[in-house]
Every structure is written in C-alpha cells, then in structure tokens.
C-alpha cells in the first residue's frame, strides 16, 4: 500500500475548503477538502439533506 | 487533457487598459484559485493577485491595488486580468495560474506591449 | 507582505559541478516552498513544492531542503540542459517570487 505524505493545508489557500477541513497531499501537489457531515462537492460547496422517507401505501 | 488558454497579444498606448482572458478546459474553475503571475522582458516573476472564482472574492498586491481587476466567468469557464493606466514599465508577459486541486499549473502567457 | 531573499542573482558553474541556490523568507513559511526553472520563451516549470517534493519527471539530481525561514536548492551534478534562470516561491501567506538566479556554464 502505497504511503501519502499529507499536511494542513498553507494559509494561501484559507477559505478554500467552505464546509471541511483543508489537506495537502504532498505527493499528489494539491490540496483536498475533507468535507463536514452533509457536504459535498470538491470544496464541500454542496449541502445535501438525505431524507428517509417512510414506505408508501402500496408498499405495506 | 486540463488546459489553460490565454487571449494572444496586445499592444496598447500609455493610459489605455488592457483584459486578458485565461479559458479552462478539462477542468472547473470554481474548483479552483486562479492567480496572475506577471514577467517583465528580462526580468523575474512578479505575482499580482488572485480570484476565488466560486465567490469572486479577490486578493491583490499593495502595489497593483486600484489599477489591477481579477474577476472570473464561471458559466464559460474564464478569469480575466484587467490592468488600466498602461504605462511602459507593464510591458510584461501575463500568465494566468491555477492553484487548489492541482499545484500551480500555467497558461501559456500573454504579451502586452505599452508602447506610444 | 512575505519577502523572498534570493542568492545569489547568478552563478557560473562547470558541468558536473554542485550547484546551490538559497531563499531566506522575512518570516516563518512553514516549509511552503516550491522552485521553478525558466528558459527562455518558455513558461516556468515546477521542479520541487513543499521544500523537498520533487515533481514526476524532474532528474533527481534535483533537491530542496530547509525549514522555518530559510531554504536551499541544488543541482547535485549540472548538465548542460539546466543552464536556466531558477525562482523559488513561498505559497504560506499568498505568493513572493524571489528574484530569479540565473545560471550559466563556464
């Protein structure tokens, strides 16, 4: 299993990750947002509400 | 393939502005920061600013504040550079630069000339 | 404003020889160093980030080193394809080029 080599992202890049935790992946030359719970998106720009809707009728 | 393209020359008289336009392909710019990096003939690198094209917010250098203007096009995938009261010494060759999901890659770079 | 001390502006060296450039930043950039080498015409290349990572394709005869404030380049044996002008550029707190070291053969 290859190793990656990862620290916290530069202060260069604040505000970068909107909704998560910014890493740089050294060996990779970027930086990866780690997103909080309910955010998507490269950057965790994206809100999603995962709904769990109960059975319909037809399926009782 | 990523690529940033760069608008092509320009030659422009002292006082006028100038906008130069860098297109992303392969890539989204709201993934992205892009920066402009500036190269006077025969003489080093100069970094002027920077575009969070997802939120327009911007960061420039003291020394280029007020006459330098870094926006982004999200819906074409374009950041432009203006930079207003030409004068001889912004004779430079100006690189767009992204930064973010991948460190640092160029455009190719664009000549302006400043020239009466 | 971060500022990047580059020494020395140039540098003439024999082929073969060990080649080192260096970077002092006016404060602490936490290692958050990458080297550029430009030819001329040409856009600069990435060589080396992160002080000592070294780019997929760059020869390891290549290297970085330091931390804190300041920071070294090397060309461990030069070759004549490296005669370039080579930048080092601090990304902690936006971005400083340092002046460029140009570096020719004897």
């Known amino acids: 299993v290859a190793q990656v080599s990862i620290t916290k992202c530069s202060s260069d890049m604040n505000g970068y990750c909107l909704h998560g935790q910014c890493i740089y992946l050294v060996d990779m030359s970027q930086n990866y947002c780690r997103c909080e719970v309910g955010y998507t998106g490269v950057r965790c720009e994206h809100f999603f509400l995962t709904v769990h809707q109960p059975l319909s009728k037809e399926y009782v | 393939q990523d690529q940033l393209v760069q608008s092509g020359a320009e030659v422009k008289k002292p006082g006028a502005s100038v906008k130069v336009s860098c297109k992303a392909s392969g890539f989204n710019i709201k993934d992205t920061y892009i920066q402009w990096v500036r190269q006077a003939p025969g003489q080093g690198l100069e970094w002027m600013g920077r575009?969070?094209?997802?939120?327009?917010?911007?960061k420039y250098v003291p020394k280029f504040e007020g006459r330098v203007t870094i926006t982004a096009d999200t819906s074409t995938n374009t950041a432009y550079m203006e930079l207003s009261s030409l004068r001889s010494e912004d004779t430079a060759v100006y690189y767009c630069?992204?930064?973010?999901?991948?460190?640092?890659?160029w455009g190719q770079g664009t000549l302006v000339t400043v020239s009466s | 404003d971060i500022q990047m001390t580059q020494s020395p502006s140039s540098l003439s060296a024999s082929v073969g020889d060990r080649v080192t450039i260096t970077c002092k930043a006016s404060?602490?950039?936490?290692?958050?160093i990458a080297w550029y080498q430009q030819k001329p015409g040409q856009a600069p290349r990435l060589l080396i980030q992160?002080?000592?990572t070294l780019q997929p394709g760059v020869p390891s005869r290549f290297s970085g080193s330091g931390s804190g404030t300041d920071y070294t380049f090397t060309i461990s044996s030069l070759q004549p394809e490296d005669i370039a002008t080579y930048y080092c550029l601090q990304y902690d707190n936006l971005r400083t080029f340092g002046g460029g070291t140009k570096v020719e053969i004897k």
């Open positions: 404060q602490d950039i936490h290692k958050y």
């Open positions: 575009i969070d094209p997802l939120n327009g917010n911007t």
């Open positions: 630069v992204r930064s973010g999901t991948l460190f640092d890659f």
């Open positions: 992160y002080t000592s």
